[in-house]
Interface confidence: low
Amino acid sequence: MGRARDAILDALENLSGDELKKFKMKLLTVQLREGYGRIPRGALLQMDAIDLTDKLVSYYLESYGLELTMTVLRDMGLQELAEQLQTTKEESGAVAAAASVPAQSTARTGHFVDQHRQALIARVTEVDGVLDALHGSVLTEGQYQAVRAETTSQDKMRKLFSFVPSWNLTCKDSLLQALKEIHPYLVMDLEQS
């Protein structure tokens, strides 16, 4: 876990400033798998290589993020960089969290996690335990560290929820399961509300 993210970052850091700009423009029009959302143009154009890598992984998760990066690089004629990513993909294998369930397809189904976002931000206190349960399966290393870096429980939960829009149903279920184990009474209370 995290290896694909590092490979994407290395590839993007190999781009010149103008190539990075072209990469972003192509990312705005590239054909996406059904159900996946597009990174908003305004935010996308303001990102450096690190920000963009994090956004690619949070929107598409590692496996599809890697694939998408390769597609765009090939489209730009940067075959060598794309080949380096292909090698990483073959070595690391597919990441389960980026499986066939589209990341954006469940956003409208009213999952517990979406319904109770504000309450969870306000009331979850044992965030590190939740993070450990999600680390490796749902959260990349970079995302895990980013949430851990926040100081208060509320800030940690806000940061965690910043990644939720790109999650599929499996990811949201994993968070719910972690909450049931760590904050069972809170979950029961919210389910009854």
Partner: antibody, heavy 117, light 106 residues
Framework: QAQLQQSGTELARPGSSVKLSCKAS????????INWVKQRTGQGLEWIGE????????YYDEKFKGKATLTADKSTSTAYMELRSLTSEDSAVYFC??????????WGQGTLVTVSA | QIVLTQSPAIMSAFPGEKVTITCSAT?????MHWFQQKPGTSPKLWIY???NLASGVPARFSGSGSGTSHSLTINRMEAEDAATYYC?????????FGSGTKLEIK
């Protein structure tokens, strides 16, 4: 206030080496490429190379490979350029500049290197 | 590598006159950047990504172009615009600069 502070004037003997520094402040050093540019008196700008401090990745103009070595120290937010086997052709002002495409390029004040016997 | 050729090398213009500096590339360049430099000072970013004025640059300046042909235009020349202007491409390593255009006021 973002700043790049370059080291002072260098007077060097032919055949020797110098190491120029470029200290960053007021911005996150690791997310920018740091470029180095040469300008001889009365001449134009020549791009030497670029380093990404986070990864240590470097890119050089072929002309400066073997002449210049770019490094960076993340702990002190300082980029370095070592010039070796100096000749009079290396006498010039050397600029460091940070880049991030939507902000364009921001330059240090320059370091004058004079190579003389 | 991409070679950038600027023309003219030196030019002078009257106050109020329209000035155009061109930058021709040996290969297609996605975006061109322009720098202004006055004697004894560091270059300043003047126009970035072909047509965007850097902070503090007067609106009389503009940039345009695509592919191998790019230009910087001053709508009405003023004394403070006297300087050397350089184009730079960051589309492909190694990044390269044009040879510069020295603009003087008559």
């Amino acid at each position: 206030q973002a700043q790049l502070q370059q080291s002072g004037t260098e007077l060097a003997r032919p055949g020797s080496s110098v190491k120029l520094s470029c200290k960053a402040s007021g911005f996150t050093f690791t997310i920018y490429g740091i470029n180095w540019v040469k300008q001889r008196t009365g001449q134009g700008l020549e791009w030497i190379g670029e380093i990404y401090p986070r990864s240590g990745n470097t890119y050089y103009d072929e002309k400066f490979k073997g002449k210049a070595t770019l490094t960076a120290d993340k702990s002190t937010s300082t980029a370095y350029m070592e010039l070796r086997s100096l000749t009079s052709e290396d006498s010039a002002v050397y600029f460091c500049a940070r880049s991030r495409e939507w902000e364009g390029v921001f330059w240090g004040q320059g370091t004058l290197v004079t190579v003389s016997a | 590598q991409i070679v950038l050729t600027q023309s003219p090398a030196i030019m002078s213009a009257f106050p109020g006159e329209k000035v155009t500096i061109t930058c021709s590339a040996t290969s297609s360049v996605s975006y061109m950047h322009w720098f202004q430099q006055k004697p004894g000072t560091s270059p300043k970013l003047w126009i970035y990504s072909t047509s965007n004025l850097a902070s503090g640059v007067p609106a009389r300046f503009s940039g345009s172009g695509s592919g191998t042909s790019h230009s910087l235009t001053i709508n009405r020349m003023e004394a403070e615009d006297a300087a050397t202007y350089y184009c730079q491409q960051r589309s492909r390593y190694p990044f390269t600069f044009g040879s510069g255009t020295k603009l003087e006021i008559k």
